[in-house]
Structure formats: C-alpha cells, structure tokens
C-alpha cells in the first residue's frame, strides 16, 4: 500500500503539501516574536513564552499540548553583588576592573533583565594570584605546558581563550592542573572574521561582547541533583557537595577589551609556537605572572553567583498517528536563551513553530501521520540540557519501547554558506534522498538541488559525489535520546565556510548582540536559509512519521563500523611493542563488523522483498530497524560515564561538542604511554575491544531472521 492508503488520507496530502505550506515570512514573524525580551531559563518571561507556545500549538491543531515542569538546579549572578575580575597592586588596591555588563545594542537600552555575562554554576570565591595563559585550555595545551614547558598551574589563575572545545572541558582541565580560578575570553582570532564589522554594523563580536555559558561536566546526567531520575515533586535531591558535574573553582568570562588589559602585562615564558598566538596586540606570554615592571601585581576574581533549585517548563505537543500511534517521532528544540536568543535558540524555535503550523494545517484538512509526532520546546538547555534530559528520564520506559527517531532543532543557522548535518548512519540515505528533492537556496545554484550545492561546498572526505555528514557529539538536546536511550537521532542547520573553527561558534554566540536584527540584517534577510532548514528538519520528520517502511538503511552502519574499527586499530598499532607484549587482538571486533556487514546486507534484501501488505511482518521489520540503534546501548554505560551508554558513539572526553567513535577503546588508549601500570592499562584496552566486539555482534543478531 502507499503511505496515503495506509493513513487513510487523500493523495494531495503528501510531503509536497507539507513542504509547500512552510513559509519564510512566517518564520521571520515567529523569530521576531520570540526575541523581543530575554527568555532566561527559570524566569517568569520564559514561563510566559512556554504558555504562549502551548496556546499557539493548540491553535495550530495539535491533538494535545501540555507543560511538563521540573525543579532543577540553575545558577544566577547575584543582582546586588556583581561578578568581576581585578588587577591588584601590592597594597591590594584594584587598579583595573573588568566591565560589569555588555553595552546594550541599539534599541535595547531600556530592556530589563538582561543577565550580565557569567559562567553558570561557577562556585563563589575571590581567589587572587599570578596568571598563566593556557591557550584554549585543551588537553594538549596542558600537556604542552606541563610536560614540555615544565610550567606548573597549581595555585595559579589561568586565562584561556574560548573556542575549539566545550568550555566545561576547559574548566575541568584547569581544575586537574591545580588552577584556583579560570578566566575565559573571546579572542578576535576566533570571534572576529577579517573584513567584517562589529555589531551593530556587522556580525562580528565587539570588544565589550562576552560569551555566556555553563561550565558543567555533567556527562549526560541532566539535573545535577537528580541524576538518572526526573526532578519531580517527590524527587530525592543530592546535597550540593554530591551534585554531578559542578566546577570546584571560580570561573568568569570576559571580552577582548578586558582580556587585552590582562594579557598585555604577561611575562614569563614566550608562547611555544604560533598556534598559541591570537590576534590581540599582546605578546601571548604564558607566564606565570606579569612582566618586570608589573611583577608585584596580581589578578583577583570576585565571583558571587548562586546555585538555586528553580522550576522549568517544557512544552510537549502531540499529533497522534493514525496507524501506529505507539511509535514516536520527536522534533525538539530549546526555548530558553541567555539573552535575546536571536540565533540560539530562537532561529530554531521559529522553524519548529512553522513546522507545527504546517502539520496542523494538514491535520485540519483530515490528514494524520502514520506514526505519532511529538513536538517539544525544551527549557534550560543552556544550563546543561536539563529540560530534555528530565523529560526523557521521566518517560524513559515509553521512549525506549516506542521511540523511532529524534530530530533536534536548536539554532537553524550558524552561517549562511551551506548545510551541515550530524546524524546516525541510519539516516544517511534519508538525508541524501530528501536533499535531492529540495531546492538549494544558495547563490549560484538556482534551479539546482540542495544536495548538489551541499556536496559541492562540503564534500565527503571519503566518498566522491557525496556530502559530508558528521558524527553526533553533544552539547545539545539530542544527547539523552541518542547517547543514553539509543534512539536514532539527527540534526541539521546552515553553517559557515569555516572548517578550521568548527567548534568555536559564530562570533556573537551567547552574547547580548544575538538579536533579531543580527539575523534579519546580516545572516538571512530573506529567511531563505531558515526555510531550507525547516524543509530539511520538517521533511525528515514527515518521512520518519509517514513512510510505510522506516527510512533507515542498516548497510550504512556497516560501512561506518568498518571505518571506525580501522581507525581505532590504527591508533592502537602505534604501540606495537605493547600490543605484542600484552597480546592485544582486534580479531573479535573485525569479525563482528564482518558479521554485521553480511547480516545487514541480507536484511536489506529481505526488506525489498517482503509483503508490505501484511501488517504483522511490516511491523516486525520496522521494529528491527527501530531497535537497531537501541542495540548499540550498553546498560552499564562507559567507564565513569554511566549516562553515555552508546558503544559506537559518545561525546569526546576532551570536547563535549565532538563525537568520538568506539569511545571506550579510544579513552582506554588515550595517553596510555603515561599510565603508571601498563599491564592494567592494556588490560582495559582488551576489555574495551571485547565490549565493542560483543555489542556489534549483538546488534548484528537483531537484524537476523527472527526464527
């Protein structure tokens, strides 16, 4: 049967009808509406926006729209006791203080409740000491400092530039190095594109602009006080000393005007190489401490933020499926912002709103999807993916049995160059086929498909004529669905032509200057890129919810498993003596991948041939596809990261934003030459190979004929 017959609808209500209903002008209006005041998690303004969205989704025609609230740990600056950093002289006098707020953008001078820049969840404290410049504060930067340069960060305040890796990893690395405070700053090398003006005259970061953000190391736990369980009315909460992922040293972010004042006085060691130099007119000396004339001066931090259990609100909308109402396709993105949220998140929320409106229009005309579609407006994403994680914890039993797919919908744009997609390999073919049917919005590609412009601008490094699709990492609301629950997930947005700066974000990220005008004037005046992202996200949801056979191709998983096995093998073989000494074999893993490849191939053949009019067999085959992602979940989780349970993918232990393949083996091998007990370390490598091989083999067997 066709999908139209299966869902008892008229033929005109197909994907085309859904896509044609999406309008750029509506996305523009919704973005404007969502960005006029701040919507910080835990505030009245964000609660009011939740109720507005609930009301509008009901008007659009969803079957039900409910608020799901949780009481989670959030963090706010002290309104009467501001955070700042000083340079103090030998008498303890403050001879320089960093700014207390960002100069507001034009038109927003009288807006209240703009939270000043702060590092969410920083503990209180007033440490003072010598400064050490630690570059991006990556693992390799601290290796360079400690091992090569013999610089000790213990008892020092470190200053690190934003970019390359998640800020929480920077703080963790600084803590492990013994630092007593961290200053984060935006260097123009990373947040000021050459030839572009500063906001409000362009999309670059002005010197007074500052990136806010949380500095947690939650590793997928959700609310720090209720790991594994929802923060509901009867929750048992940990004491703050036992909370998950909180930093132990004060942290504060600053802009590059203030950073200049701190860095220009730096003495001590010269930067080890040019990769440690940014674009400020300072020497980028590493320290410790200030140069000759200023050697008696110190840096002092003044941090007075508080952690508070606060109510948050998700909005959950339901469009019931006509044929398989117990199969859920989820489209979710967050609503809370640091300030106005012009890009993050409201460029995504506006797209979700328009997708809901389009689906609602079809529903009012008598159409229903085959499967149930759930729409979510998550709260407190900026405070550690809290809203999505708490909801998933509350509904985990339903989700693990009924969850088909999760499509994420945070920022629709981080540039206007080309498409960027990160997803499970199961969705590669879906994304390829969909983008071949969509028109490219790019200049010079008029009349061409999105697939064509995307492939031209962002080619796959392995397969010619195909576009790059990246691994899922974390730092967004898909985390709990993919990394913890094993629900096939994907995300799509428009991005910049800036591969070297992949994880630094756009210049005005998390600053007060992320406004509606930023998007309307500089990024997407016609909202054509937003519309394209709506078509990609909405089209994926439509296909996942409406196709008779789920649009997953298990053969693509086989291809990447082989690639990932090859990669981790080559990393391991860089230690041939130890491999030999400890008899480390990859036979089990390569054998499992071989079996997976053969079984996936046979499954795909059966998928072409089976009787789709037999609902029992159809459901059986679809369940095998749905549960394949689930089969990669290890109930015990990864070592020391129990909520990262996917054996094939996890957020990198060194950068939450990046995905790592075979993370258990990778982490066991990382820096293994420095381990004090090599026998134990290589034993753990062997154990992780065993776990990976078993998991791949077990997943393969879920695709075998059932009897």
């Amino acid at each position: 049967k066709s999908s139209n017959e299966a869902t008892n609808i008229t033929p005109k209500h197909n994907m085309k009808a859904f896509l044609d209903e999406l309008k750029a002008e509506n996305i523009k209006k919704f973005l404007y509406n969502f960005t006029q005041i701040p919507h910080l998690a835990g505030t009245e303004q964000n609660f009011q926006l939740a109720k507005q969205i609930q009301s509008q989704w009901k008007e659009f025609g969803l079957d039900s729209v409910e608020l799901a609230h949780y009481d989670v740990l959030l963090s706010y600056p002290n309104k009467t006791h501001p955070n700042y950093i000083s340079i103090i002289n030998e008498d303890g006098n403050e001879i320089f203080n960093t700014s207390l707020f960002e100069p507001p953008p034009p038109g927003y001078e009288n807006v209240s409740d703009i939270v000043p820049p702060f590092s969410a969840f920083s503990p209180q404290g007033m440490p003072e000491g010598d400064l050490v410049y630690v570059n991006y504060a990556r693992t390799e930067d601290f290796f360079k400092l400690e091992r090569d340069m013999k610089i000790n960060c213990s008892g020092k305040i470190v200053i690190a530039r934003y970019g390359k890796v998640f800020r929480g990893n920077k703080v963790k690395n600084a803590q492990l190095a013994g630092a007593k405070g961290v200053i984060l700053y935006s260097d123009p090398a990373d947040y000021f594109a050459p030839g572009v003006k500063s906001y409000p005259d362009g999309w670059n970061l002005p010197g007074g602009g500052v990136q806010r953000g949380n500095i947690l190391n939650l590793n997928g736990a959700g609310d720090p006080l209720t790991p594994g369980y929802p923060a509901n009315e009867y929750a048992y909460r940990r004491g703050i000393a036992e909370a998950v992922g909180l930093p132990s040293i004060p942290v504060h972010p600053i802009g590059y005007y203030d950073a200049q004042k701190l860095l220009e006085k730096m003495g001590g060691s010269a930067p080890p190489d040019s990769s440690w130099r940014g674009s400020l007119k300072v020497p980028y000396n590493v320290g410790p401490g200030f140069t000759g004339n200023f050697s008696t001066q110190k840096v002092k931090m003044h941090i007075h933020s508080t952690n508070e259990v606060t109510r948050i609100y998700n909005v959950i909308g339901t469009l019931r499926g006509a044929v398989e109402p117990d199969r859920y396709v989820i489209l979710g993105g967050h609503r809370d912002s640091w300030v106005f949220g012009g890009i993050d998140p409201q460029s995504g929320a506006a797209v979700v709103h328009e997708i809901v409106r389009s689906f609602g229009t079809l529903k009012k005309e008598g159409w229903r999807p085959r499967r149930t579609i759930l729409f979510a407006s998550w709260d407190a994403e900026e405070f550690g993916l809290l809203g999505s994680t708490e909801w998933a914890e509350e509904n985990s039993r339903l989700l693990q049995e009924r969850g088909v797919a999760y499509i994420n919908a945070d920022s629709s744009i981080e540039g206007n160059y080309t498409l960027r997609v990160d997803c499970t390999p199961l969705m590669y073919s879906l994304v390829h086929n969909l983008t071949k049917e969509l028109k490219s919005p790019d200049e010079g590609f008029e009349g061409k498909s999105l697939y064509e412009s995307w492939t031209k601008k962002s080619p796959s490094p392995e397969f010619s004529g195909m576009p790059r699709i990246s691994k899922l990492g974390s730092g967004n609301d898909f985390e709990v669905f993919f990394q913890r629950l094993g629900i096939a997930s994907g995300r799509a947005r428009y991005t910049k032509n800036w591969e070297t700066n992949k994880f630094s974000g756009y210049p005005l990220y998390h600053s007060v200057y992320e406004t509606y005008e930023l998007v309307e004037k500089f990024y997407d005046p016609m909202f054509k890129y937003h519309l394209t992202v709506a078509q990609v996200r909405g089209g994926m949801v439509f296909e996942l919810a409406n196709s008779i056979v789920l649009p997953f191709d298990c053969r693509d998983y086989a291809v990447v498993l082989r690639k990932y096995a090859d990669k981790i093998y080559s990393i391991s073989m860089k230690h041939p003596q130890e491999m030999k000494t400890y008899s480390v074999s990859f036979d089990s893993l390569f054998s499992a991948v071989k079996n997976f490849t053969e079984i996936a191939s046979k499954f795909s053949e059966r998928l072409q041939d089976f009787d789709k009019s037999n609902p029992i067999v159809l459901r059986m085959m679809n369940d095998q596809l749905m549960f394949l992602e689930r089969a990669f979940i290890d109930p015990l989780g990864l070592p020391d990261r129990p909520f990262y349970r996917h054996v094939i993918y996890a957020p990198s232990s060194h950068n939450k934003y990046a995905g790592e393949s075979f993370p258990g083996i990778y982490d066991a091998l990382f820096d293994i030459e420095s381990k004090v007990d090599p026998s134990k370390a290589w034993g753990e490598v062997k154990r992780q190979i065993y776990v990976a091989a078993f998991t791949v083999q077990a997943a393969a067997e879920t695709l075998s004929e059932v009897a």
């Epitope: 392995e462 690639k563 990669k567 008899s583 036979d587 071989k594």
Partner: nanobody
Framework: EVQLVESGGGLVQPGGSLRLSCTVS????????VSWVRQAPGQGLEWVSA???????YYADSVKGRFTISRDNSKNTLYLQMNSLRAEDTAVYYC??????WGQGTLVTVSS
C-alpha cells in the same frame, strides 16, 4: 592457522626505492586491517603504516609522503612501497595483523 610471510627486503642506496610484500593465509584477509611495523638495529618496535579493511590508510609521521601502503584482497597480499629511502629507514620490517599475529620480518638496509 594464521600466517604472514614478508618478502622484498634488501640493500638499497639512500634515495632509492623498494617494495615489500606480505602474503597472508588463515583468515579472511579482506575483513581485517593490517600493518607494517619495523625494528631498527638496537631499537624498539616502531609502527610504520596501516591499511583498514575499508581501504583507509594511516602513516607514521616519519614516513608520510614517502611510503605508500596498499592491499590486493584477491591475492591476500599487503604491500609497502618505500620511496626516498634514508639510512634511518634501515630496519627489519614486519607485517602484523595486530598484537598477536606477526610475520618473521624482512630486512631492509639503506646504505651507500
């Protein structure tokens, strides 16, 4: 029983080329990654290059741009094309499946 047999070693002048081969048996060659590892006189083992089951190639920094690894699955054979050879490339070159299955090695001497 897994077997790996190297050949192609010998004496070559600096700047010269050599091609090593490794014929394998006892396992489904096409489904496994394999490596070249070397041991210079009086030194420890050094990984040189690997080729994945999927055909992806990996090289040590010391040989990148000079050595090329390849495989012919139909012949169950692994190759290492070594160009622009230097004195420091002098070593016994081993074909290895992993830490367990290795060949006996073939000696490459680079000397004028």
């Amino acid at each position: 029983e897994v077997q790996l047999v190297e050949s192609g070693g010998g004496l070559v002048q600096p700047g010269g080329s050599l091609r090593l081969s490794c014929t394998v048996s006892g396992f489904t060659f096409s489904s496994y990654a394999v490596s070249w590892v070397r041991q210079a006189p009086g030194q420890g083992l050094e990984w040189v290059s690997a080729i994945g089951a999927g055909g992806g190639t990996y090289y040590a920094d010391s040989v990148k741009g000079r050595f090329t690894i390849s495989r012919d699955n139909s012949k169950n054979t692994l190759y290492l094309q070594m160009n622009s050879l230097r004195a420091e490339d002098t070593a016994v070159y081993y074909c290895a499946k992993d830490g367990v299955d290795w060949g006996q090695g073939t000696l490459v001497t680079v000397s004028s």
